[in-house]
């Protein structure tokens, strides 16, 4: 009789999950050599412990421990960049803009990233089938609580002034209840950090409106402010225009305002 | 959902150049390989090549060597593909195709297709 | 460059019935193959991967078998949806080639 196998609304475990943890880790250490001397089988050990076993909405930041210590990264502080709804604008910007990082450019952030994981209440078998959705089961679900831990950490590191893209063609450009709204913003450090400088993306090529004046970034700034954090805002009108820019910023076009 | 989309059909006059686009979403662009299949009416699959779009490098399969040119570009998340001194016989349909995960595929050896555009005929004819 | 040879190159049968399609490749593969179904005027879409592991959202009347050089796809219940050419391919190492396909064909 073959066991109950709990349903979840989310899609499950992305296949040959193991392996590609595995491997994302091996090219990483690879490619960035003050990350050489991180044992990858040892991270693919704690990052299985981190849900393995365990009920998939009953999973804690402490469970990610190990694996957050295995992957201790120093990244400049002062060249960190945080985003919201806007990830693939981010990362073409720090592809290009390489000494500048989105979480997803350091080792844990690439290790998960487009992934998605869960596991089963007392049993070693990982879940292909379903793992659970943030909205419609639970949020301390292996996925949530991972970026939720990793992103913590990213913005308690960052220092001096700290960037963020926000998307300017959503109804809410910041969101209290995305992870930047609901944890980044929260934990930058004022001690270490002046600044949080906004960049707000532009959707439409005719769209001029100065979108630092949305009721939505003036939230963010009174929730900055409060922090004792300074707060700067800029249009990106032209995103494309914007990466020619960083990719050639001696063009004669890249003068005027983007 | 991950999607890809490409370029319409084409008519080409033979010794002609052929671009074609395939634009990508709904997924991490450069964290996968993206390939390029054809397929003669009437006849099988043939791998043409492929592209890594983290860095830009390329494979291509003997018989398109010189004759074949993949390119990406990560700001509009799109792999081109051009093909120069056209004959009768590239008349195709041409498919580009999703890879495995890069770090995946070169690690394990394991280099299938999960998601394919929709073709893009290619006539070549005097 | 490893040659895929497919057998048979045609097939009739019949709905509900169990149809078995091959695959050989001409030096050893591992587990590296892939299993894709094409129906016409239509993309090929990726059912097996890694030789035995089912793609998401097919049918668990595929199923594949097979490391090294033999390898087969087997549809264990005939469904009016699976009436369309199946090709292999092996997915180990450069250039990357396929089988000539097989076509199933209603009896």
């Known amino acids: 009789v073959p066991r109950w196998r709990q349903q979840w609304s989310g899609p499950g475990t992305t296949k040959r999950f193991p392996e590609t943890v595995l491997a994302r880790c091996v090219k990483y250490t690879e490619i960035h050599p003050e990350m050489r001397h991180v044992d990858c089988q040892s991270v693919w050990d704690a990052f299985k412990g981190a849900f393995i076993s365990k009920h998939p909405c009953n999973i804690t930041e402490e469970d990610y421990q190990p694996l957050m210590k295995l992957g201790t990264q120093t990244v400049p502080c002062n060249k960190i960049l945080l985003w919201s709804r806007i990830k693939d604008l981010a990362h073409q910007f720090t592809q290009v803009q390489r000494d500048m990082f989105t979480l997803e450019d350091t080792l844990l952030g690439y290790l998960a990233d487009d992934l998605t994981w869960c596991g089963e209440f007392n049993t070693s078998k990982i879940n292909y089938q379903s793992c659970p959705d943030w909205r419609k089961d639970c949020s301390n679900n292996p996925v949530s609580v991972f970026w939720k831990t990793v992103s913590r950490r990213f913005a308690e590191a960052a220092c001096d002034v700290v960037h963020v893209m926000l998307n300017g063609s959503r109804s809410k450009i910041f969101d209290k209840n995305s992870t930047f709204g609901s944890v980044e913003v929260h934990n930058l450090q004022p001690e270490k950090v002046q600044t949080l400088e906004a960049w707000v993306i532009h959707g439409g090529r005719e769209d001029s409106r100065d979108l630092c004046q949305d009721p939505t970034i003036k939230e963010l700034e009174s929730i900055i402010s409060k922090r004792n954090i300074q707060f700067s805002c800029k249009n990106i009108y032209r995103p494309d225009k914007f990466l020619q820019c960083v990719k050639n910023p001696e063009d004669s076009s890249c003068t005027s305002e983007i | 959902q991950v999607q890809l989309v490409q370029s319409g059909s084409e008519v080409k006059k033979p010794g002609a150049s052929l671009h074609l686009s395939c634009k990508a979403s709904?997924?991490?662009?450069?964290?996968?390989?993206m390939h390029w299949v054809r397929q003669a009416p009437g006849q099988g699959l043939e791998w043409m090549g492929v592209?890594?779009?983290?860095?830009?490098?390329?494979t291509y399969a003997q018989k398109f060597q010189g004759r074949v040119a993949m390119t990406t570009d990560t700001s509009t998340y799109t792999v081109y593909m051009e093909v120069n001194s056209l004959r009768s016989d590239d008349t195709a349909v041409y498919f580009c195709?999703?890879?495995?995960?890069?770090?995946?595929?070169?690690?394990?050896?394991?280099?299938?297709?999960?998601?394919w555009g929709q073709g893009t005929t290619v006539t070549v004819s005097s | 460059a490893i040659r895929m040879t497919q057998s048979p190159s045609s097939l009739s049968a019949s709905v509900g019935d169990r149809v078995t399609i091959t695959c050989r490749a001409s030096?050893?593969?591992?587990?590296?193959l892939a299993w894709y179904q094409q129906k016409p005027g239509k993309a090929p879409k990726l059912l097996i991967y890694?030789?035995?592991s089912l793609e998401s959202g097919v049918p668990s009347r595929f199923s594949g078998s097979g490391s090294g050089t033999d390898f087969t796809l087997t549809i264990s219940s005939l469904q009016p949806e699976d009436f369309a050419t199946y090709y292999c391919?092996?997915?180990?190492?450069?250039?990357?080639?396929f089988g000539q396909g097989t076509k199933l064909e209603i009896k």
């Open positions: 195709a999703r890879g495995s995960d890069n770090a995946l595929a070169d690690y394990y050896n394991s280099y299938d297709m999960d998601v």
């Open positions: 709904g997924y991490t662009f450069i964290n996968h390989y």
């Open positions: 592209i890594n779009p983290r860095g830009g490098s390329t």
């Open positions: 030096q050893g593969i591992s587990s590296a």
């Open positions: 890694d030789a035995s």
């Open positions: 391919q092996q997915a180990n190492s450069f250039p990357l080639t």
